[in-house]
């Protein structure tokens, strides 16, 4: 099991306010666009616009998603893709609230199992590698909602139905209410509120902040954990430096999580994962003879 | 407050059809999905499945595929269960409740209706 | 599909008495387990959620516990009113499912 696993790669055991960020609304620049005498203008903001063919990528994924999960079958794409496009298109990109988001939600509708979920922070790659060889646990990337919406960027402008593939809000430069952050802040909370019994987190043991309360982990995710159905939040370290054998779940910011998530009245567990490579390697392959014996 | 009101009780023959209506007040409709219980006489409750009251899509169990319809009249807040070609063993009390939806997980049902009794009979 | 297993089918008690009613899972479902209690010739009524979570309006000597597999509904001190019919329900999987029921009868 994965008890063996994180054996074998000398690993530490440790028993063990949502931060608002006040943006400025950007009001942006404006930009003169289209021809002829009377000129359109065009709202500029300091973000990339919308991904290149955002619709035809969406309606993709969703028939992708349905076409491996038997469960999601009875999803109809064309309303999903109706239901997202509503949620943003002809809406000021910096005016999205949860509730422009609410009937997605609702054609999106799928039970995860509650305590076989895994948020991470900062190392989304080595969290989707391990739930594509540890299938029966998820991320959020690994429902529809969150893989419809996976590394893509989407805004439309107020009052008129065209999406915006020149720019779109930054969360920093111009405003937190923008689509891409209402939509993850929107799932983020409600997949967290799902979770129970053990929840896992992956952190990036490599960064100056393991724990960010700036992340979607630290501002929603955490906040959203419910104490009446969550026993314990474990944490898993992940080193970078192939010689970096510190106790990283020592860490000042691992001990600032470990504060907030006791006052929620939910223990927390923390883990270091020296070797990540050698760690999924185990993963795909627990029988293997350094998998079961401490290295 | 609160109330989940369903319509009243029938007799039917068997090979005939029934409709119970469940009338939602008190909450927002479409914020709940909305499931179906079965009770036959002295036994237990069984779940036939549920409706989601957005998209209007129903899930069923799978001893209820087939004769069983769930549906929406979602401006009137009602949710609706038909049974065709009824059976002797479709004689039960035909219950409904509501579920909150979180997206990625169901709350119990919170609030049921009082119940319709269907009796199949020759 | 999960099945969830209660026992015992009757529990014969007298008021005043303490008891546990059990409900056990076919596979780990975490803490999404709901207990309702169902009176003769009425609809069931919700008491406990997730295993242990009390519910407003209802009375504190209902309680419950446990995670996994295993689930207890107890009742501290039965009362008159209580004795009925208790079902566990999971809502652990899309497919909801739940326990075939304990009668609660006076001794």
């Known amino acids: 099991g994965l008890n063996d696993i994180f054996e074998a790669q000398k690993i530490e055991w440790h028993e063990g306010s949502h931060h608002h960020h006040h943006h400025h609304h950007g009001s942006g620049s404006l930009v003169p666009r289209g021809s002829g005498s009377v000129p359109r203008w065009r709202q500029q903001w300091s973000g990339p616009g919308t991904t290149k063919r955002f619709p035809e990528t969406v309606l993709a994924r969703c028939v992708k998603y349905t076409e491996i999960h038997p469960e999601m079958r009875h999803v109809d794409c064309q309303s999903v893709w109706d239901a997202f496009k509503g949620a943003f298109i002809s809406k000021h990109p910096c005016n999205i609230t949860e509730e422009d988001y609410q009937p997605l939600m609702k054609l999106g509708t799928q039970t995860v199992p509650c305590n076989k979920i895994l948020l991470w922070s900062r190392i989304k790659d080595l969290a989707h590698q391990f739930t594509q060889v540890q299938r029966d646990m998820f991320t959020l990337e690994d429902t529809l909602l969150g893989y419809l919406a996976d590394d893509l960027t989407w805004c439309g402008e107020f009052n008129t139905s065209k999406i915006n593939y020149q720019s779109c809000p930054d969360w920093r430069k111009d405003c937190s209410n923008n689509p891409v952050s209402v939509f993850w802040k929107t799932v983020s909370r409600r997949f967290a509120e799902a979770a129970c019994d053990v929840v896992h987190v992956m952190l990036n043991g490599s960064r100056s902040k393991i724990f960010d309360k700036n992340s979607t982990f630290g501002s929603v995710e955490v906040h959203n954990l419910q104490p009446e159905k969550v026993q314990t939040l474990e944490a898993w370290v992940i080193h970078g430096g192939r010689e970096d054998s510190r106790d990283l779940c020592q860490d000042p910011t691992i001990k600032e999580l470990e504060s907030i998530i006791s006052k929620r009245n939910i223990q927390f567990s923390c883990k270091n994962i020296y070797r990540p490579d050698k760690f999924l390697q185990c993963v795909k392959n627990p029988e293997d003879s350094s998998c079961t014996s401490e290295i | 407050q609160i109330q989940l009101v369903q319509s009243g009780p029938g007799l039917k023959k068997p090979g005939e059809s029934v409709k119970i209506s469940c009338k939602a007040s008190g909450y927002t409709f479409t914020d709940y999905s909305m499931h179906w219980v079965k009770q036959a006489p002295g036994k237990g409750l069984q779940w036939m499945g549920w409706i989601n009251t957005y998209s209007g899509k129903p899930t069923y169990a799978a001893d209820f595929k087939g004769r069983f319809v769930f549906s929406l009249e979602a401006s009137a807040s009602t949710a609706n269960l038909q049974i065709s070609n009824l059976k002797n063993e479709d004689t039960a009390t035909y219950f409904c409740?509501?579920?909150?939806?979180?997206?990625?997980?169901?709350?119990?049902?919170?609030?049921w209706g009082q119940g319709t009794s269907v009796t199949v009979s020759s | 599909n999960i099945v969830l297993t209660q026992s015992p089918a009757t529990l014969s008690v007298t008021p005043g008495e303490s008891v546990s009613l059990s409900c056990r899972a076919s596979q780990s479902i975490g803490t999404s387990i709901h207990w309702y209690q169902q009176k003769s010739n009425e609809s069931p009524r919700l008491l406990i959620r997730?295993?242990?979570q009390s519910i407003s309006g209802i009375p504190s000597r209902f309680s419950g516990s446990g995670s996994g597999t295993d689930f207890t509904l107890s009742i501290n001190r039965v009362e008159s009113e209580d004795f009925s019919i208790y079902y566990c329900?999971?809502?652990?999987?899309?497919?909801?499912?739940f326990g075939s029921g304990t009668k609660l009868e006076i001794k």
């Open positions: 329900q999971q809502s652990y999987s899309s497919l909801v499912t």
């Open positions: 997730y295993a242990s």
């Open positions: 409740a509501r579920c909150y939806d979180g997206t990625f997980y169901y709350d119990p049902m919170d609030a």
